[in-house]
Interface confidence: low
């Protein structure tokens, strides 16, 4: 006869491990007992359990409550055992020794491999600002046994670097994703993907990128110079910019206070019926936590009774 077992048994941490040991004998042969021991290299054999044809299952005190026979129906030639709730410390070499009648003893070894699936964590880097050089966007760490694979899934252009720390029974892998921040990255997902043989599917953690920026400011409303004449109603100037965080707007007049009747409504400056009093240099100040920008325009209100051309000067400054 011969013993049938597996070279390697792989289980996930916390699962039950079936350690197979089946004697395929000739007709009339019987298994008297099956002795299981742990036989790691450099250490003496540690008795695990004994399956006896007459006296039943005996379990070593060190494994009390953790070693069982598979549920019935059981083949009398099957010496397999179940190791409940596998932990990392269970990883190692095991030997099954079968005593048969009348053929004698047979033995076989197997290796138990306990997979410790990773628990990934994603840590965003420092605040991203447009104009920075290569900057850490996020780091992703996963610890498991064997070492997990940590990669990134994103449309964003960047570079990755990985390092690993080996512990006695596991390894931690940290991958960092670096990029040069630009406003186009705002709202883009950056996903850490962790692969491991103990996972049925990859674990994914997504971080949404936020890049602080402030666009140049400009003022709209003076495109048609002839509309800015005395008596015109509904004249307005609108300040254009964009940013992250969203910017706030402030209007001032460079050559004096804002004329009475002029309404400030966020990015818009609304005028009452125009008079020559409304001529002047108006400044839009745009700011957010990242930066600030100014744009100024010169308004020259035309008197239709005069035959002078209107001058408009647009200046943008940072």
């Amino acid at each position: 006869g011969e013993l049938e077992t597996s070279d390697v048994v792989t289980v996930v941490l916390g699962q039950d491990a079936k350690l197979p040991c089946f004697y395929r004998g000739d007709s009339g042969e019987q298994v008297g007992q099956v002795a299981w021991a742990r036989v790691d290299a450099g250490e003496g054999a540690q008795e695990l359990a004994l399956l006896h044809s007459k006296y039943g299952l005996h379990v070593s005190p060190a494994y009390e409550g953790r070693v069982e026979q598979p549920p019935p129906p059981r083949n009398p030639l099957d010496g397999s055992v179940l190791l409940r709730n596998a932990v990392q410390a269970d990883e190692g070499e095991y030997e099954c020794r079968v005593s048969t009648f009348p053929a004698g003893s047979f033995q076989a070894r197997l290796r138990l491999r306990v997979l410790v699936p990773p628990l990934p964590s994603l840590n965003p880097g420092p605040a991203l600002e447009e104009g920075q050089g290569l900057t850490l966007a996020a780091s992703c760490t996963a610890e498991g046994s064997p070492a997990p694979s940590v990669t990134w899934d994103t449309e964003v252009k960047g570079t990755t670097s990985s390092r690993s720390f080996k512990h006695s029974r596991s390894a931690a892998v940290t991958s960092e994703f670096h990029l040069v921040p630009s406003r186009s990255m705002n709202g883009q997902p950056l996903t850490c993907v962790v692969s491991h043989p103990g996972l049925l599917q990859d674990q994914r953690i997504t971080h949404i990128l936020h890049v602080s920026f402030l666009a140049e400011a400009s003022v709209r409303g003076l495109e048609d110079q002839n509309l800015w004449h005395i008596g015109r109603e509904g004249a307005m100037l609108k300040c254009l910019s964009e940013g992250q965080p969203p910017p706030s707007y402030n209007w001032t007049r460079l050559d004096g206070p804002l004329p009475s009747g002029v309404r400030v409504d966020g990015d818009t400056l609304g005028f009452p019926p125009l008079t020559t009093e409304h001529s002047g240099i108006y400044v839009c100040h745009v700011s957010n936590e990242f930066s600030s920008r100014d744009s100024q325009v010169t308004v020259d209100v035309l008197d239709p009774q005069e035959d002078s051309g209107k001058q408009v000067d647009l200046v943008s400054a940072s």
């Epitope: 932990v87 990392q88 410790v116 610890e143 512990h167 029974r169 931690a172 996972l199 674990q203």
Partner: nanobody, 120 residues
Framework: EVQLLESGGGLVQPGGSLRLSCAAS????????MGWYRQAPGKEREFVSS????????RYADSVKGRFTISRDNSKNTLYLQMNSLKPEDTAVYYC?????????????WGQGTQVTVSS
């Protein structure tokens, strides 16, 4: 059943220290990363610190770096948070947490929390 029980909170003056503990049961403690979170009144729960199963890797929120230290004793199934140089803005309910579940699902378990108040 996973159980997490925090203790060690209390009232402390600014600049003082506290040590929080989290006793864990119902899972193989040494195999799981653990974390501390906190929630101030009217604010969302925020990450404070985390530690890997072996204790070899730690992470901290910027706001507590250099002041708080996370540690664990796997022989006692206990997670700790040593908090020094406490500030009024550290006032919150502190929770310990574990993320478990391997076969495609991830489940967060939280303790009931312990109140930390920093006030003169």
């Amino acid at each position: 059943e996973v159980q997490l029980l925090e203790s060690g909170g209390g009232l402390v003056q600014p600049g003082g220290s506290l040590r929080l503990s989290c006793a864990a049961s119902g899972f193989t403690f040494s195999s799981y990363a653990m974390g501390w979170y906190r929630q101030a009144p009217g604010k969302e729960r925020e990450f404070v610190s985390s530690i890997s199963g072996s204790g070899g890797l730690t992470r901290y929120a910027d706001s507590v770096k250099g002041r708080f230290t996370i540690s664990r004793d796997n022989s006692k199934n206990t997670l700790y948070l040593q908090m020094n140089s406490l500030k009024p803005e550290d006032t919150a309910v502190y929770y310990c947490a574990v993320t478990t579940g391997y076969q495609g699902g991830v489940y967060d378990y939280w303790g009931q929390g312990t109140q930390v108040t920093v006030s003169s």
